[in-house]
Interface confidence: medium
């Protein structure tokens, strides 16, 4: 029956001290891990991989390196200035045989707009990706190549959650056997046909994504063909039947009252840790109202926070969240009005999310300012608008054409924003820096890996 199918990939997620420094608390880090895993779970579960359906993800274990671990010699991710290939290698030098995949989340600004890196799975041979076991490689080191890394920073800015979720889905897509999309069928965002182009590129597009186009969180047919071949061959090696929650992964899942991790991680006076006997683990301790693992509206003293306490900061598009006094959850924040400016006036709020372009405020569409001969690139990091479906009207917000809306004020894209039709990202000097999708690969060829591994790592 379907329920007995091995369709769940169990994850080990580690975060480094810089990720912790950005999000501030263990609970906030766990919420980030949870949101990323749920996002890819939704994408993969709703994709039919040539008859293989309901592929899901579950966190088996987490390790959060806090700022206190910055000097810990047992923490391999403690070094401040590590390139993306080295960072992936540090993850791969650990033994991850107990997991389908092992990821590290960081907040580092890697070179050239790289947001992630992962080993690519293949249907045959020991090449990396899902279920790959630790082996000795030609540089004399044992490595687990069922690994990947992602960062939430790009050119000094933090990427929006939807982009980070797609980055994670993209890197996991490599682990599952998909190379980058190529060819007209699988890169519609590069099409000259406006109807095709407006839906954007798919998850495995090699360069940049905004995350808000129809295709951005879907796999292309190219990816589906590749992934289904790898799943066919590999999933029985390490996938498990879905169902039981995993007490100890720090996430409160169905059937658990709380989850503060294993005894070495649990700092929670409210919850029985995962090393406790079966009837007690991941249950609230007697007389305790809640556990901080359930949400930000529970105090360390195991009581619901009072009605007036803030649990979520006011953001560009949503008002602050206020605890309601009877649940650990942070209630929904009321959205700010649609078309409120956000992301430093480059975008507008839609249903509480900073999602639309500032152009939409005036009934226009965002476009890329690029001269047809490709020589004039100084406006590539301007916000440019056009009349709907009329690229001939595309002009910078600073142009005379749109002066009635923007009063001649040039609005520039935020650093880290996609530019030049998603071929690159804007840097801090407002230059559009093209993404070299295979840059780290080329550097790795000069490094420590043997030739048979070269084609099996990708951004």
């Amino acid at each position: 029956t379907t329920s007995a199918e091995k369709n769940t990939c169990q994850l080990y997620i580690q975060t480094d001290h810089l990720f912790f420094k950005y999000y501030g608390t263990r609970e906030a880090v766990i919420a980030q891990i949870s949101s990323h895993v749920k996002a890819i779970d939704t994408i993969y579960q709703t994709t039919d991989f040539s008859g293989i359906r309901n592929i899901s993800f579950m966190v088996k274990r987490i390790r959060i390196n806090t700022t206190a671990d910055e000097k810990d010699p047992t923490n391999p991710f403690r070094f401040p200035n590590i390139g993306v290939e080295k960072f992936l290698e540090l993850n791969s030098e650990q033994n991850h045989d107990d997991y389908c995949l092992a990821y590290v989340f960081t907040d580092r600004d890697f070179d050239d707009g790289v947001l992630g890196l992962a080993w690519v799975g293949a249907p045959s041979g020991s090449s990396g990706g899902i279920c790959e076991k630790s082996k000795l490689y030609s540089d004399g080191k044992k490595k687990s190549l069922n690994t990947g890394i992602i960062t939430v920073q790009n050119y000094g800015s933090h990427v929006p959650p939807k982009v980070s979720h797609i980055t994670f889905a993209h890197e996991v897509g490599h682990n599952f056997g998909s190379p980058h999309d190529s060819g007209t069928e699988c890169t519609p965002g590069e099409s000259k046909n406006l109807g095709q182009k407006e839906n954007g590129n798919y998850i495995m597009y090699a360069r940049a994504t905004s995350g808000d186009k129809l295709n951005n969180n879907k796999f292309s047919l190219c990816s589906i063909r590749n992934i289904s071949q790898v799943l066919e061959k590999k999933r029985n090696n390490c996938f498990v039947e879905s169902g039981q929650p995993i007490c100890g992964n720090g996430m409160v899942e169905q059937g658990e009252e709380c989850d503060c991790g294993y005894s070495d991680q649990c700092k929670d006076e409210c919850c029985f840790d995962a090393n406790q006997p079966e009837g007690r683990k991941c249950k609230l301790k007697p007389g305790k109202q809640c556990s901080p693992s359930q949400g930000p509206c529970c105090t360390a003293q195991c009581a619901f926070k009072s009605k007036s306490e803030k649990c979520r900061d006011d953001s560009d598009c949503a008002r602050e969240g206020i605890c309601n006094g009877f649940t650990a959850l942070c209630p929904a924040s009321d959205p700010k009005p649609n078309f409120t400016d956000c992301n430093r006036h480059t975008q507008v709020c839609i249903n509480g999310q900073c999602a639309g372009s500032i152009c939409e405020k005036y009934g226009l569409e965002e476009c890329t300012c690029a001269s047809s001969d490709g020589k004039d690139d100084k406006e590539l990091c301007h916000v440019c608008c056009m009349k709907k479906m009329d690229p001939s009207t595309c002009a910078s917000t600073g142009s005379v054409q749109w002066s009635r809306h923007f009063s001649g004020r040039t609005i520039t894209l935020q650093p880290g924003s996609p530019c030049n039709d998603f071929r690159g990202y804007c840097d801090v000097f407002m230059r559009c820096r093209l993404v070299d999708a295979d840059g780290p690969l080329a550097r790795l060829k000069k490094a420590i890996f043997s030739p048979e591994l070269y084609e099996n790592i990708a951004e």
Partner: nanobody, 116 residues
Framework: EVQLVKSGGGLVQAGGSLRLSCAAS????????VGWYRQAPGKQREMVAA???????NYADSVKGRFTISRDNAKNTVYLQMNSLKPEDTAVYYC??????????WGQGTQVTVSS
């Protein structure tokens, strides 16, 4: 995008009962927190019942002992059983689900009117 379809509202006498249901597209309620909110005319929207992803439930003091939140994963549906209704329970009721740490957008809501 999450689609939430509410039903079960209506007019009821004080002391009566109603069951609201909220069906979702896909198995979105599994492993996600869900909540029922209400908004009475001229008042702030307030959460009245919540179910954490683990299944434990919490209620606003004003409805504790009268309202029960539950879910049926097989039907992708969340329910709010409302007993011993009072005129002050009159409001538009919304269900909501937390997806990727963000609460899904508000739907139309369903009107509940309790007459005395």
């Amino acid at each position: 995008e999450v689609q939430l379809v509410k039903s079960g509202g209506g007019l009821v006498q004080a002391g009566g009962s109603l069951r609201l249901s909220c069906a979702a597209s896909g198995n979105i309620f599994i492993n996600n927190a869900v909540g029922w909110y209400r908004q009475a005319p001229g008042k702030q929207r307030e959460m009245v019942a919540a179910m954490l992803s683990g299944g434990s439930t919490n209620y606003a003091d004003s409805v504790k002992g009268r309202f029960t939140i539950s879910r049926d994963n097989a039907k992708n549906t969340v329910y709010l059983q409302m007993n011993s209704l009072k005129p002050e329970d009159t409001a538009v009721y919304y269900c909501n689900v937390q997806v990727n740490g963000i609460w899904a957008r508000w739907g139309q809501g369903t009107q509940v009117t309790v007459s005395s």
